[in-house]
Interface confidence: low
């Protein structure tokens, strides 16, 4: 067992080294480890094959370090890994697209608060078991087409607190099991009418605190399971172009936030849902 760590076998074979001031992944981690806790240290680099010997590893926590670089082959051989937490490593900024390849059993991936500026093509390829993906509080500006395409079992996708300016047509392709999509506190000004086409099981959609002045109801039509919708804190324009959204909100049987109008001035601060149809005039 590495000097700064505690190793024990029950209830699972565990190597636990949190908050020890470690500057590198320690050598001598027992190969039988099922859980490795390295959070809260000063680790800046995860070299290739750092955990290759740990074939039984299911949980790996590397959050709250100072990671600036993760080699593409850092997690090679971890076929049984279920939970990987890399969050709160603000210097990371980018992740090689091959980093997570081969992690076919991964069900939870934390990449929040990592200073990520983009999601490279194929970053999440092959993660068929993934259920929870935490990408909030980064610096993401765009959602590339088909980024999440292989994530057919994903139920929770957290993208809030980024700089995303639009939701393109293919951003969420393949997310047939998605239950919660959190997109609040971004800069979203435009949602493609077909952006949510695959989200038939979505129950919670947060779009509050963005830059939306309009939202095509065609985008909302596929959301048959939707129960919770938050649209507040957006610059909604409540003129005739808002009539389809107004009509959709009248029929919506779930729970929705207020939709306060910004324009025209005479309706500023009023809730779109509570307006009469003939209030929505002029284009």
């Amino acid at each position: 067992c590495p000097g700064a760590c505690v190793c024990y076998n029950e209830p699972k074979v565990t190597t636990s080294c949190p908050q020890q001031g470690l500057q590198a992944v320690p050598v001598g981690i027992p190969a039988a480890s099922q859980r490795i806790f390295l959070h809260g240290n000063r680790i800046s680099h995860v070299p290739a094959a750092s955990f290759r010997a740990c074939r039984n590893l299911t949980i790996l926590w590397l959050h709250s370090n100072v990671l600036a670089r993760i080699d593409a082959a850092a997690f090679t051989g971890l076929a049984l890994l279920e939970q990987l937490d890399l969050s709160d490593n603000a210097q990371l900024r980018s992740v090689d697209p091959a980093t997570f390849h081969g992690l076919g059993r991964l069900h939870t991936l934390h990449l929040d608060r990592c200073g990520l500026q983009e999601l490279g093509p194929g970053l999440f390829r092959g993660l068929a078991a993934l259920q929870y993906l935490y990408l909030q509080d980064n610096a993401l500006q765009a959602l590339p087409d088909d980024t999440f395409r292989d994530l057919g079992n994903l139920t929770h996708l957290f993208l809030h607190g980024n700089r995303i300016s639009s939701v393109p047509e293919r951003a969420f392709r393949g997310l047939h099991s998605l239950d919660r999509l959190l997109l609040h506190q971004n800069r979203v000004a435009h949602v493609h009418p077909h952006a949510f086409r695959d989200l038939g099981r979505l129950m919670t959609l947060y779009l509050f605190a963005n830059n939306l002045s309009a939202l095509p109801t065609e985008a909302l039509a596929p959301l048959r399971a939707l129960q919770y919708l938050r649209l507040n804190d957006n610059p909604w324009v409540c003129d005739c172009r808002a009539r389809p959204l107004w009509a959709w909100l009248q029929k919506f049987r779930g729970s929705s936030s207020e939709v306060p109008c910004s324009l025209p001035q005479r309706l500023a601060g009023r809730d779109l849902k509570r307006l009469a149809a003939n209030d929505l005039q002029g284009c």
Epitope: Q83, H110, Q131, Q136, F158, H160, G161
Partner: antibody, heavy 126, light 110 residues
Framework: EVQLLESGGGLVQPGGSLRLSCAAS????????MSWVRQAPGKGLEWVSA????????YYADSVKGRFTISRDNSKNTLYLQMNSLRAEDTAVYYC???????????????????WGRGTMVTVSS | QPVLTQPPSASGTPGQRVTISCSGS????????VNWYQQLPGTAPKLLLY???QRPSGVPDRFSGSKSGTSASLAISGLQSEDEADYYC???????????FGTGTKVTVL
């Protein structure tokens, strides 16, 4: 030293309002979610509300939903709990606590509340 | 109301092993990890264990935890007089979209 210090408690009549504050020091306040937990005299702990580090996500126990509002001012390192329409059953010591996690959606683990204040007493009585 | 059930009291003599159970459901303990808190008389609660069995720095190794299905337990081996306190289990609850505490167990050192 990491510290949390609650204030704002006192005696208030049923139906009244009170605003609790929690001043944080010794850590990067905006990086942590925060919670309010209360304890009625002689009773157990009850989670009241939580807020994410940015303040963008808030959560409430059913018993206070619609009456209490949690907020934070990261520039002042301060957490707040605005309590309206107070009832006798809200009488308790109110603790603020640091939660080193992302938000309460985190399904597979929640690392607990690792720093607590000493609490402030709220009494609702006529 | 607490949705995690604990025995109201437990006791032992110094040096003995005491175990406290915590029973929940599929929406809390069944799907989420368990934390334990210790509250010494007249003080604020203190985090004792997180992630079912992890000890924060400074917590003695005589405290251990485990989880199985919808139940969890806290064991204190080598009971000491300073362990006399109230102990609470807790977990996230998916159906309530919040955090729940157990009913609490008062540990008395005889």
């Amino acid at each position: 030293e990491v510290q949390l210090l609650e204030s704002g408690g006192g005696l208030v009549q049923p139906g009244g309002s009170l605003r609790l504050s929690c001043a944080a020091s010794g850590f990067t306040f905006s990086s942590y979610a925060m919670s309010w937990v209360r304890q009625a005299p002689g009773k157990g702990l009850e989670w009241v509300s939580a807020i994410s580090g940015s303040g963008g996500s808030t959560y409430y126990a059913d018993s206070v939903k619609g009456r209490f509002t949690i907020s934070r001012d990261n520039s002042k390192n301060t957490l707040y709990l605005q309590m309206n329409s107070l009832r006798a059953e809200d009488t308790a010591v109110y603790y603020c606590a640091r939660a080193p996690h992302y938000d309460l959606w985190s399904k597979y683990y929640f690392r607990g509340m690792d720093v607590w204040g000493r609490g402030t007493m709220v009494t609702v009585s006529s | 109301q607490p949705v995690l059930t604990q025995p109201p009291s437990a006791s032992g003599t110094p040096g003995q092993r005491v175990t406290i159970s915590c029973s929940g459901s599929s929406s809390n303990i069944g799907r989420n990890t368990v934390n334990w808190y210790q509250q010494l008389p007249g003080t604020a609660p203190k985090l004792l264990l997180y992630n079912n069995d992890q000890r924060p720095s400074g917590v003695p190794d005589r405290f251990s935890g485990s989880k199985s299905g919808t139940s969890a337990s806290l064991a204190i081996s080598g009971l000491q007089s300073e362990d006399e306190a109230d102990y609470y289990c807790s977990a996230r609850d998916d159906s309530l979209n919040g955090y729940v505490f157990g009913t609490g167990t008062k540990v008395t050192v005889l």
